[in-house]
Interface confidence: medium
């Protein structure tokens, strides 16, 4: 195209520009160490520093790690981009109670409105369900029959966690940072009896008070409501529930409005030093030699030839049924099969033992 010649000529002799035949334009040549933000940069501002994968260019022009959404209660809302961090939010059915930069530090299940209350605003990733008193007759605001049911006689209605199917947690959001504990806590939440009281299911009809029964107008039959992870002690004070966050502990009973969470040693360990609602020191059962982990085969275009998956060290076994391949009836707290991309395996924290299943996938081994 002769008419393009003049444009091409304007680039010649100008070291800061080059001619791009594809777009038939003169383009600005990004200086060494800078990367074009578009196919044919026109000016210096169209060039930027390039970061490694999973890093973004922050305001100070530094490559900074994008946040991870690897906890099992988080999902990726927006991906890690060249100039902005990945953003995580609580997974469906949960809301954020403690926010963090580009993420959420603590997610809780949406409350289910108790009997006599109906959903005013459904829960979102940021906000819990908002309930309001049911008007006489069936209200169109009833999001589901569950939210409008009257209690059977003799029962005390309580907010209860929305049952969430374990299937909603995808492979990419399985526990990483929390490891065993998160998997077990999640499993305990998911398998909890629907009517058991829980710290994670509270109505938000009133920020300060929560009815032990639907609070009749003018009645004093309302109790003080504590923050998530706190319970109302005998003195009427909000007291922190114990934490089962140590890797050798699992949650035995959840944090309820009037009682602390209780922790016990994870399977394969026994309590050597007890503590209120918990165990101060767990010790392993007597152990025997472990089998060798076999090396997973190359499975994808990215290289997978490392010696073993990033799963901590294969533990010594203990001669109990929990070890190795779990029986078909094993509960989610004992064995969690992590299904991951072929070339990317999920890490387990330093004290979480693992085994490899016959498929080469890591299995959390509570033994």
């Amino acid at each position: 195209f002769p008419q393009d010649r003049p444009f091409e000529d304007t680039c010649h002799g100008n070291p800061s520009h080059y001619y791009d035949k594809a777009v038939r334009r003169c383009c600005y040549r990004c200086p060494m160490g800078l990367f074009p933000t578009q196919q044919c940069p026109q000016r210096p501002t169209d060039c930027r520093k390039q970061c490694e994968p999973d890093y973004y260019l922050d305001e100070a022009d530094r490559c900074t790690a994008c946040v991870t959404c690897s906890r099992d209660d988080l999902v990726e809302k927006t991906p890690c981009a060249w100039n902005s961090s990945r953003v995580c939010e609580c997974r469906p059915g949960m809301f954020c109670s403690t926010s963090a930069v580009n993420s959420c530090a603590r997610c809780f299940f949406h409350s289910v409105c108790p009997a006599g209350m109906i959903v005013k605003f459904p829960g979102t990733a940021q906000k819990n369900t908002v309930c309001e008193p049911a008007s006489p007759g069936v209200s169109p605001a009833c999001a589901s029959p569950e939210n409008c049911k009257e209690p059977s006689s003799g029962t005390i209605p309580q907010a209860k966690p929305t049952p969430v199917s374990p299937a909603t947690s995808s492979a990419s959001t399985m526990p990483v940072r929390g490891g065993t504990r998160l998997a077990q806590e999640a499993a305990s939440k998911l398998t909890r009896a629907p009517d058991s009281p829980s710290s994670v299911g509270r109505p938000s009809s009133d920020p300060g008070l929560s009815p032990t029964q639907p609070c009749p107008e003018g009645s004093g039959d309302c109790r003080k409501q504590c923050e998530p992870d706190y319970y109302l002690d005998e003195a009427g004070r909000c007291t922190a529930c114990v934490s089962c966050s140590r890797d050798d502990l699992v949650e035995k009973t959840p944090c309820a409005w009037n009682s602390s969470r209780t922790c016990e040693c994870r399977p394969g360990m026994i309590c050597a030093t007890s503590a209120t609602n918990s165990c101060a020191r767990c010790v392993p059962y007597p152990i025997c030699a472990a089998e060798t982990v076999t090396k997973p085969q190359d499975m994808a275009e990215k290289d997978t030839t490392f010696e073993a998956p990033p799963l901590g060290t294969q533990p010594d076994c203990n001669p109990t049924p929990e070890n190795g391949e779990a029986p078909a009836s094993t509960s989610p707290t004992q064995s969690l099969l992590v299904d991951s991309q072929a070339s990317k395996t999920l890490p387990i924290p330093t004290s979480a033992p693992v085994a490899l299943s016959s498929t080469g996938k890591p299995v959390l081994d509570a033994g």
Partner: antibody, heavy 123, light 106 residues
């Protein structure tokens, strides 16, 4: 398995240049960036920079800009680092390293290291 | 740049002991910290990544903990082969930076 094989020790005069190599094997060379780290006796390990063998893009620690040049040759699966205008301060062991491919995230902690190239600058 | 201050510089211990090495970051680095072991005349080897995850093949006597600015590497039941220098590294923000190292003498 993944291996990074570095070239042998270098003895150089002040003001001279040296070019050391890091030959990668056991994985697809263009999939991972190669990083360089300096270790001087009595000093912290220092990150020098990295090269993306696929694009040729390199990024440097500000302290090493002008001192080092990173290049890569895809045909031989080899990364190179040239040190210019050598002084006694540049006497050190230089390592090439590669990040792991672990978890769902690609953060830069080094699972694989070369054996190191010792550079001695002496008149 | 983020400064990683590691302590102690030297540590003398006996086989079977438990030792703790600490690393303090000059600013919040989340859990983007790795720990390395370097034996005399060898290259560094990764022990821990993401502050608390043990790399494959690393004995379980090595544990990592911490987040934000304070990080700890603990070696329980020290063995003679643990004679080495230990380094922390932050990979939260470029330039990547390392701690000054802790020499473990047995």
């Amino acid at each position: 398995q993944v291996q990074l094989q570095q070239s042998g020790a270098e003895l150089a005069r002040p003001g001279a240049s040296v070019k050391m190599s890091c030959k990668a094997s056991g994985y697809t060379f263009t999939t991972y960036t190669i990083h360089w780290v300096r270790q001087r006796p009595g000093h912290d390990l220092e990150w020098i920079g990295y090269i993306n063998p696929s694009s040729g893009y390199s990024d440097y620690n500000q302290n090493f800009k002008g001192k080092t040049t990173l290049t890569a040759d895809k045909s031989s699966n080899t990364a190179y680092m040239q040190l210019n205008s050598l002084t006694s301060e540049d006497s050190a062991v230089y390592y090439c390293a590669r990040r792991a491919d672990y978890g769902n995230y690609e953060y830069t902690w080094f699972a694989y290291w070369g054996q190191g190239t010792t550079v001695t600058v002496s008149s | 740049d983020i400064v990683m201050t590691q302590s102690p510089k030297f540590m003398s211990t006996s086989v079977g002991d438990r030792v703790t090495v600490t690393c303090k970051a000059s600013q919040n680095v989340g859990t983007n910290v790795a720990w390395f072991q370097q034996k005399p005349g060898q290259s560094p080897k990764v022990l821990i990544y993401s502050a608390s995850y043990r790399y494959s093949g690393v004995p379980d006597r090595f544990t990592g903990s911490g987040s934000g600015t304070d990080f700890t590497l603990t070696i329980s039941n020290v063995q003679s082969e643990d004679l080495a220098e230990y380094f922390c590294q932050q990979y939260h923000t470029y330039p990547l930076t390392f701690g000054g190292g802790t020499k473990l003498e047995i």
